[in-house]
Interface confidence: low
């Protein structure tokens, strides 16, 4: 096995770039929400911590072994072209665990994207026009999903017939942003590790 070189793998580098952008965008959005929603409990101490991906994806479980196992040969290596053909891992031999980890990240992003888009549709109806989701953050989620490019059906945006409760929507926005920031940190750590290994 050759010694690692400093230049990043061109296959993985786009994902590292996007994950860094994602972390920056969600952190900025969370800061904006905290400032704008001053009278809403929006700090990590005040909110209820809720993980919308709980029991639906297994990002932490799937991605943790990648960090624990520095030697990739310890992982169950095999060709996994059936899982991804995106620019992040374009035509490279990847471990089964790595592919599982990245597909789980993709599913996380997809779930948050649906939630955020649904929430933004409600916030746009608010006569106060107090806060909206940063289009840059939504674009960055989209870019990372495209870079991962898993063969996955698109999830339709949830439509809500009842009149939105704007107070609860803004609270839910804070809860989602806090949870998504934690997930973005995990994603960034995974991409940094994969880029360095």
């Amino acid at each position: 096995r050759n010694l690692p070189v400093a230049t990043p793998d061109p296959g993985m580098f786009p994902c590292l770039h996007h994950s860094q952008n994602l972390l920056r965008a969600v952190s900025n959005m969370l800061q904006k929400a905290r400032q704008t929603l001053e009278f809403y409990p929006c700090t990590s101490e005040e909110i209820d911590h809720e993980d919308i991906t709980k029991d639906k994806t297994s990002t932490v479980e799937a991605c943790l072994p990648l960090e624990l196992t520095k030697n990739e040969s310890c992982l169950n290596s095999r060709e996994t072209s059936f899982i991804t053909n995106g620019s992040c891992l374009a035509s490279r031999k990847t471990s089964f665990m790595m592919a599982l980890c990245l597909s789980s990240i993709y599913e996380d992003l997809k779930m948050y994207q649906v939630e955020f888009k649904t929430m933004n549709a409600k916030l746009l109806m608010d006569p106060k026009r107090q806060i909206f989701l940063d289009q840059n953050m939504l674009a960055v989620i989209d870019e990372l999903m495209q870079a991962l490019n898993f063969n996955s059906e698109t999830v339709p945006q949830k439509s809500s017939l009842e009149e939105p409760d704007f107070y609860k929507t803004k609270i839910k926005l804070c809860i989602l942003l806090h949870a998504f920031r934690i997930r973005a940190v995990t994603i960034d750590r995974v991409m940094s590790y994969l880029n360095a290994s």
């Epitope: 009278f39 809403y40 409990p41 005040e46 209820d48 107070y167 609860k168 609270i171």
Partner: nanobody, 114 residues
Framework: EVQLVESRGGLVQPGGSLRLSCAAS????????MYWVRQAPGKGLEWVAT???????AYADFVKGRFTISRDDAKNTLYLQMNSLKPEDTAQYYC????????RGQGTQVTVSS
């Protein structure tokens, strides 16, 4: 165990006033944000007002200028002074420790009618 007990509400004429109080126990009241939420017949739970630790307050647009939320940390008591009451203020009012009203008292009925 968190306990929130609201005072009795009542029947008030339009334009009238009413003061609700809420006795809190089982948690550190002085370091908690507190809320009043309400539920009108056939409607969902609606946020009314928030009071932060230290006393600064925020109100829903529909009660702004008419309702005042206050607290007495020494007595572990939350208050809601309701003035210029309207028929549409008729609802079950709850004192709550969380914004969504999950940690709330039994509620007290306020009816505004002539």
């Amino acid at each position: 165990e968190v306990q929130l007990v609201e005072s009795r509400g009542g029947l008030v004429q339009p334009g009238g006033s009413l003061r609700l109080s809420c006795a809190a126990s089982g948690f550190t009241f002085s370091s908690s944000w507190m809320y009043w939420v309400r539920q009108a017949p056939g409607k969902g739970l609606e946020w009314v007002a928030t009071i932060k630790t230290g006393g600064s307050a925020a109100y829903a647009d529909f009660v702004k200028g008419r309702f005042t939320i206050s607290r007495d940390d020494a007595k572990n008591t939350l208050y809601l002074q309701m003035n210029s009451l309207k028929p549409e203020d008729t609802a079950q009012y709850y004192c709550a420790r969380d914004y969504a009203g999950r940690l709330r008292g039994q509620g007290t009925q306020v009816t505004v009618s002539s």
